[in-house]
């Protein structure tokens, strides 16, 4: 039930006075006023920016907003030697070379400070090759290259298309598979819809538009000097040879029409099926090297980037809690851009500005909430979630003992088709009945509501009549208080028809061309569709942290964690034989599933019936809802990944950017039959079935009576 | 084939306007941006402006933005150009051209039209 | 805006011989470079675009090269249909702008 049950306020002062105040013609003036001039993490620029953030939060009416600093390692382009790629002839003459930035969107030709494309810590080197088009560069990709093609990538340079994975997983396979350097470009097949022009006239991307990005593989460990503690004034950072996650080899992002350059004269093998084919006039054969005529001709990268220690800053605003001031509900997005940030991050941080001025509007009136609620303007998202993770290890003592939840409020679109929501199964509940109150922006559904557009455009796969609500993966500011710290977390935005779009993410997503005018021209222009996440993320925020019985559901944890018993049990049965030598089951972790589901069963039997006016009993059977995510956390992480700790979720090993559900068995299971020790492999399953199933045991028993 | 036929050209006072039009035939014109080049006599070319598919956004010289407009009517295939002011430097022939998108080549041009400005 | 200079302004070449016309932008124009061909009292023809892509048509003696700055256009071997006269084009930002043009003539 939405409840208005705060202390000090008047009945006026609920959730629906809350959603009121929320206007769209206010996220448009923010989003404006935020995407003017580039906000790259590490400049003045966005040092301004988060002043002005501090300033206006004040304004605003919250109790307190201050500057969180820390300084972290950053990757900048070399700004007098610019990084590019060239095709070399025999006598080692550049032929061709690939451009060194994007041509500006007009209005905003003489802009400065636009930082060309690269790949945010790439090493420095000038490798020169033979070239593999090696597809997505996802495991499978090189699963078929090198066991079923047998084309050795070793020594090579790497051209891959942008799309299906996060990046750094594609250039963590790339260095595994032996390559000297890895190119990234962006297909028209994964970037460009059919029938939409690119930009400036439509929101696709031009031959010239190139995705930046980071390209680390950090597993959740922040600053990648620093890992586990934060970037302080004191701190003991590791030598550049001991960081986390950085890549071996240089990388570099280029656009279309300089990949079709080096794709159309690529020899070799043809491409082992159409999957691997873009839509590119080009035979997108395999490699390695150019065709009979280009058989001399080389790839050579010029890669001079450098990495930084620089000052980052983070906002943190506090609204305090009326009754429960030691209990916190963060809402956090981010501030830094790559260029202009139109979408990312400045349409989700423009929802988190009018979100806090409609709570402040409740608080000058009177009016605070039960408990506390943190806002937070992250800085170093770009580069790998750092502003976040460093001030959650600064402050994690606190925020383990006292975190409710997080929502998470990145970009507010990536399309304008239908909602989309990844969250702990401990708000399923939240949201559903959230968007049952909440009116549907969508054409065709007006009078109707949010859950109704919501299920009919993205319908649940198991549960017919109710929406599809993803998994929690990573490649955003959650990731450390869910995967490390265990506090419930959620995510919303407006998305694209998967059905219909089946590129990657949005065309412009990390190009110049990310601009307001995309915006505002193409995807959003009466904003009704960041009015509609606004009110989600602001009616979840609201309901963590203004009901009197925290809107968790622990039998939805029971539901899901049986699927994903299901799930990791059938892929384990693909190997019958192995299973019954090794003395493989998985009883233990069924039964305390089923174990899990009668508790789970029995507390909220106890939710519904106990004295709500008793303080004691409250704050009792809440800190069980509050502390059932942390019970997730496994205390030594998972295997080579130490700050990812949930046992029940974790971010992919092979995308990032996906969740996986019991990470630690499927990890062991994973590509088990190419194993050279059989014996070990299925061991580490064993453990890994233990570890599962005992942590999902002790889990349960947090919810037991608790004498 | 891609045919493009500018007309209204001439002689015109100073002070004086002028409309000039380009037939277009031979490809889907709202597929493309289109433009106008003009070429003064023994001089090299001069971008004008040019308009984008569905004519929502233009662009223009800066020195001649407030005297000159760009225009399009798909449903005529037609690219016009309303020259207001026209002053003696106007004197040139004018090309209508075809582009792809906003940073593309003109790949395709028409013949040219010659407008004289001269009292 | 971005100016755009050409050199020479006007060659001297016989048939079969290598010729090669250069343009220097006045700032990185991003491979956001044209070639056009113009024979007296014709409308121009595009050549090459996006600095080395022959457009349709055109005789793979012409080639397109450069990056940042500085651009080439290179005809192999000179044919007597290709004297008249050159003009390379930036699309990279507004407004559009050309070389002065480079005249090749028959020595």
């Known amino acids: 039930k939405s409840s208005n049950e705060a202390t000090n306020i008047t009945p006026k002062h609920n959730m629906k006075a809350f959603l009121d105040e929320l206007k769209a013609e206010n996220i448009k003036k923010f989003l404006y006023n935020f995407t003017q001039i580039p906000h790259l993490a590490g400049t003045e620029q966005n040092f301004q920016l988060a002043k002005q953030i501090q300033s206006q939060w004040k304004e605003f009416g919250l109790d307190s907003v201050e500057l969180a600093h820390y300084d972290v390692l950053l990757s900048y382009p070399n700004k007098t030697h610019p990084n590019y790629i060239s095709i070399i002839n025999e006598d080692g003459n550049e032929i061709f070379n690939t451009s060194l930035f994007e041509p500006p969107p007009p209005g905003y030709e003489n802009v400065s400070d636009i930082v060309p494309p690269f790949s945010a810590f790439s090493p420095q080197g000038m490798p020169e090759g033979d070239l593999v088009y090696v597809n997505y560069a996802r495991t499978e990709d090189f699963f078929k290259l090198e066991r079923d093609m047998k084309i050795n990538c070793s020594g090579k340079i790497v051209i891959a298309r942008y799309g299906k994975v996060f990046r750094g997983n594609k250039v963590k396979n790339a260095q595994l598979a032996g390559a000297k350097g890895v190119i990234l470009y962006s297909d028209p097949a994964d970037y460009f819809a059919p029938g939409v022009k690119s930009y400036p006239d439509g929101w696709n991307l031009p031959g010239g538009g190139v995705q930046r990005g980071n390209i680390l593989n950090l597993n959740g460990a922040g600053d990648p000097l620093t890992p586990g503690y934060p970037a302080n004034e004191y701190a003991y950072r590791r030598g550049i040879a001991e960081a986390v996650g950085l890549p071996s080899i240089p990388v570099h992002p280029i656009g279309y029409y300089d990949a079709q350059k080096l794709l159309e004269k690529m020899g070799g093998s043809a491409p082992p099926d159409s999957s691997w084919r873009g839509s590119l006039k080009v035979p997108y054969n395999v490699g390695p090297g150019f065709t009979g005529n280009f058989s001399t001709q080389k790839v050579k990268m010029h890669i001079h980037s450098t990495n930084e220690v620089t000052r980052i800053y983070n906002v943190i605003g506090t609204l305090r809690g009326a009754v429960e001031p030691d209990r916190y509900v963060i809402l956090g997005g981010h501030r830094d851009s790559w260029v202009f940030g139109g979408i990312d991050p400045q349409s989700g941080a423009a929802v988190v500005h009018e979100i806090v001025r409609s709570f402040g509007t409740l608080k000058k009136e009177g009016w605070r909430p039960r408990r506390t609620i943190l806002f937070a303007s992250w800085d170093a998202e770009e580069f790998g979630l750092l502003g976040s993770t460093e001030w959650a290890e600064e402050n994690s003592r606190l925020l383990q003992e006292r975190g409710v939840a997080y929502i998470n409020a990145d970009s507010s679109i990536e399309g304008n088709y239908t909602l989309r929501v990844d969250c702990t199964p401990l708000m399923y509940s939240l949201v559903h009945n959230l968007t049952k109150e909440l009116k549907s922006p969508d054409e065709g559904f007006e009078g109707k509501s949010l859950y109704e557009s919501w299920t009919k455009k993205s319908p649940s796969p198991e549960f017919s009549g109710m929406p599809r609500i993803s998994k929690l993966g990573s490649g955003n500011d959650f990731e450390v208080f869910f995967q490390r710290l265990g506090i419930a977390s959620g995510r919303a935005r407006y998305t694209k028809n998967w059905e219909t779009n089946k590129f990657s993410g949005y065309p412009l997503y990390h190009s110049v061309y990310e601009t307001y005018e995309l915006v505002e021209k193409f995807y959003d222009p009466m904003f009704k569709y960041h009015l509609t996440v606004a009110q989600v993320r602001g009616g979840m925020v609201f309901e963590l942290a203004n009901s009197i019985v925290l809107p968790f559901d622990c039998r939805d944890y029971a539901v899901v964690l049986r699927k994903y018993a299901d799930k990791i049990y059938s892929i384990s049965m693909k190997h019958p034989q192995e299973m019954k030598t090794y003395s493989v089951s998985f009883d233990s972790l069924f039964s305390a599933v089923k174990n899990f589901t009668e508790i789970a069963s029995k507390f909220s039997e106890r939710l519904q019936d106990f004295d709500k006016s008793n303080p004691i009993v409250l704050r009792m059977m809440n800190d069980q809802l509050m502390f059932l995510e942390r019970a997730f956390i496994d205390p030594l992480g998972l295997p080579d990944r130490p700050f990812y700790r949930h046992v029940i979720y974790a971010p992919s090993s092979h995308n990032k950017y996906a969740g996986e559900s019991f990470p630690g068995i499927y990890d062991a299971l994973f590509d088990i039959e190419s194993k050279v020790d059989p014996s070990k492999a299925w061991g580490e399953v064993k453990r890994q079935i233990y570890v599962a199933a005992f942590t999902v045991q002790a889990a349960a028993e947090t919810l037991s009576e608790v004498a | 084939e891609v045919k493009l036929v500018e007309s209204g050209g001439g002689l015109v006072q100073p002070g004086g306007s002028l409309r000039l039009s380009c037939a277009a035939s031979g490809f889907t014109f709202s597929d493309y941006y289109m433009a106008w080049v003009r070429q003064a006599p023994g001089k090299g070319l001069e971008w004008v402006a040019n308009i984008n598919y569905d004519g929502s956004s233009t662009y223009y010289l800066d020195s001649l933005k407030s005297r000159f407009t760009i225009s399009r009517d798909n449903a005529k295939n037609s690219l016009y150009l309303q020259m207001n002011s026209l002053r003696a430097e106007d004197t040139a022939v004018y090309y209508c051209?075809?582009?792809?998108?906003?940073?593309?080549?003109?790949?395709?041009w028409g013949q040219g039209t010659t407008v004289t400005v001269s009292s | 805006d971005i100016q755009m200079t050409q050199s020479p302004s006007s060659l001297s070449a016989s048939v079969g011989d290598r010729v090669t016309i250069t343009c220097r932008a006045s700032?990185?124009?991003?491979?956001?470079l044209n070639w056009y061909q113009q024979k007296p009292g014709k409308a121009p023809k595009l050549l090459i675009y996006y600095t080395s892509s022959l457009h349709s048509g055109v005789p793979s003696r012409f080639s397109g090269s450069g990056s940042g700055t500085d651009y080439t256009l290179t005809i192999s071997s000179l044919q007597p249909e290709d004297f008249a006269t050159y003009y390379c084009?930036?699309?990279?930002?507004?407004?559009?702008?050309f070389g002065g043009g480079t005249k090749v003539e028959i020595k």
């Open positions: 051209a075809r582009g792809g998108d906003y940073w593309d080549a003109m790949d395709y």
């Open positions: 084009q930036q699309g990279n930002r507004l407004p559009r702008t």
């Open positions: 700032q990185d124009i991003s491979k956001y």
